[in-house]
């Protein structure tokens, strides 16, 4: 009779993470008699996964009934594969001996490659805020995927971006990768409403990419424009001095009015008026009695913008002329007032 | 980490000059502080030294005290100190390159005013 | 000028129990408050910021709330361990400030 051989057809199997791998095996005779054991991996460090014999394998379960006589189907199901799973699986006849069985054939090993989804793409931004016309750096990372072949690409506002550099790690062989990817972007003072995307595209995700997202709103710092005016007012001895903060982003800003070096007031701004761009404007007025000043007033707005050091704009008060409007021609946006009276 | 060194007994009127030094933290794209605490006070902020180098400090501060820094080393200047000036001077990072929170502090030097 | 007023000044609570601190600003400054824990001899230590996120490694029995210009921080299960100073500080603004923590809360755990 023809020596028993042990055949496993499939050379290699793929399957994704999270479905049952089937690895064949038959034998070509009952003879001799024992049991079929499976490893991954050959040589001394190789990995049992089912023996037919004893033990218990919760993930494995048989194709065919093993306890009936003449059955020569040793084919065993893997449930819920995952990436560490990946490896050649020898389905190996032993003899039976005493007092231990005598390894007899092994079959030519299937390698088993499993499909791995990355991971959502997590986009980060610098940790601090950047001005417009700076170049600031982004993140991408998606991790555990499998195969190695990925593609990344960097979006603003929808716009493709090229400055970027991408690695996916190990090099060399790994049951799953990882990529990582930074982009460099150039802020532009309209970029509060701006997204940066990044999108992954794997086979694992049949053509449907994931995509990590950040708003550069967490990044930007739109710095103010300042603007100082003087307003006629009925009152002869009133003088309404206005500091209008224009454009600015984020919100945090603090107002400090100073009457010839020597602080006023301060405030924070609260009733903002938001522009089409995402930036805010807002005002603040100071009602100066000119009768409780004898010299010329020096008055000075200055604002502090999100924790960045303070800048701010002065308005010299001419108390000896009649009060009449001066300063800037220019016509008001449409901003909020925080109107507090100064006498 | 921080560390604050020159802490010692100086009497009154004599300039000192306290160093933050830092080790394995870039400071140059930090803002950083510096904070002090009389014996069984509270905490009590000095100034700020933002990451451009501008520098802000309490209104009680002007004058009497001066910051600067390089890349890895922070300094608080005391013009001339008084003996309400002892106290535990601790260095501190910011969480970014403005004003807001102090993320990373020094374990402190004590620093002593007396005749 | 922003000034941070905090209450009270001592609190002593059993073990299990619940310590509640107050932060008042005198204007707003929407979430920009800070609380640190300081225990005695040794540098001080951020526990929250933003008014509400717990800072990397602190225990999730502490918490804060509040915006604007009232900020509360609470120990929920108050343990031995948590007995220190706790300080409010702004993160806001700092142009002509005197201080911007609070005076302080000493937590006393019997």
């Known amino acids: 009779e023809e020596e028993l051989q042990v055949i496993q057809p499939d050379k290699s199997v793929l399957v994704a993470a999270g479905e049952t791998a089937t690895l064949r095996c038959t034998a070509t005779s009952l003879i001799p008699v024992g049991p079929i054991q499976w490893f991954r991996g050959a040589g001394p460090g190789r990995e049992l996964i089912y023996n037919q014999k004893e033990g218990h394998f919760p993930r494995v379960t048989t194709v065919s009934d093993l306890t009936k006589r003449n059955n020569m189907d040793f084919s065993i199901r893997i449930g819920n594969i995952t990436p560490a799973d990946a490896g050649t699986y020898y389905c190996v006849k032993f003899r039976k001996g005493s007092p231990d069985d005598v390894e007899f054939k092994s079959g030519a090993g299937t390698e088993l490659s499993v499909r791995a989804k990355p991971s959502a793409p997590v986009v980060s931004g610098p940790a601090a805020r950047a001005t417009p016309q700076h170049t600031v750096s982004f993140t991408c990372e998606s991790h555990g995927f499998s195969p190695r072949d990925i593609t990344l690409k960097w979006f603003k506002n929808g716009n493709e971006l090229s400055d970027f550099q991408t690695n996916v790690d190990p090099v060399g062989e790994s049951v799953s990768y990882s990529i990582h990817s930074t982009a460099k972007v150039v802020l532009t003072r309209e970029d509060v409403h701006s997204q940066v995307i990044c999108e992954v595209a794997h086979v694992t995700l049949q053509g449907d990419p994931l995509r990590g997202t950040a708003n550069l709103s967490e990044t930007i710092r739109v710095p103010p424009t300042l603007e100082v005016t003087q307003q006629p007012v009925r009152a002869e001895n009133q003088v309404n001095v206005t500091c209008q903060v224009r454009k600015f982003y984020p919100q945090r800003l603090q107002l400090t009015w100073l009457e010839n070096g020597n602080v006023s007031r301060t405030e924070t701004a609260s009733t903002v008026t938001e522009n089409k761009d995402g930036t805010y404007n807002w005002m603040s007025w100071l009602l100066v009695n000119v009768s409780a000043h004898r010299d010329d007033v020096k008055l000075t707005c200055q604002v502090e913008h999100d924790g960045q050091p303070a800048v701010s704009k002065s308005h010299d008060l001419k108390v000896s002329a009649h009060p009449k409007e001066q300063g800037s021609n220019t016509a008001a946006e449409n901003t909020g007032s925080n109107e507090r009276n100064i006498y | 980490s921080l560390e604050e060194s020159g802490g010692r007994l100086v009497t009154p009127g004599t300039p000192l000059t306290l160093t933050c030094t830092a080790s394995g933290v870039d400071l140059s794209n930090y803002a950083m502080g510096w904070v002090r605490q009389a014996p069984g006070k509270g905490l009590e902020w000095i100034g700020i030294i933002y990451a451009g180098g501008s520098t802000s400090y309490a209104t009680w501060a002007k004058g009497r005290f001066t910051i600067s820094k390089t890349s890895t080393t922070m300094d608080l200047k005391m013009t001339s100190p008084t003996t309400e000036d002892t106290a535990t001077y601790f260095c501190?990072?910011?969480?970014?390159?403005?004003?807001?929170?102090?993320?990373?502090w020094g374990p402190g030097t004590l620093v002593t005013v007396s005749l | 000028a922003i000034d941070m007023t905090q209450t009270p000044a001592s609190v002593s609570e059993p073990v299990g129990g619940t310590v509640t601190i107050k932060c008042q600003a005198s204007q707003s400054i929407s979430s920009w408050l800070a609380w640190y824990q300081q225990k005695p001899g040794q540098r001080p230590k951020l526990l929250i910021y933003d008014a509400s996120k717990l800072a990397s490694g602190v225990p999730s029995r502490f918490s804060g709330s509040g915006s604007g210009t009232e900020f509360t921080l609470t120990i929920s299960g108050v343990q031995s361990d948590d007995a220190a100073a706790y300080y409010c500080q702004q993160g806001y603004a700092v142009s002509y400030v005197e201080n911007i923590f609070g005076g302080g809360t000493e937590v006393v755990v019997k």
């Open positions: 501190a990072r910011h969480r970014s390159d403005g004003y807001d929170y102090f993320h990373l």
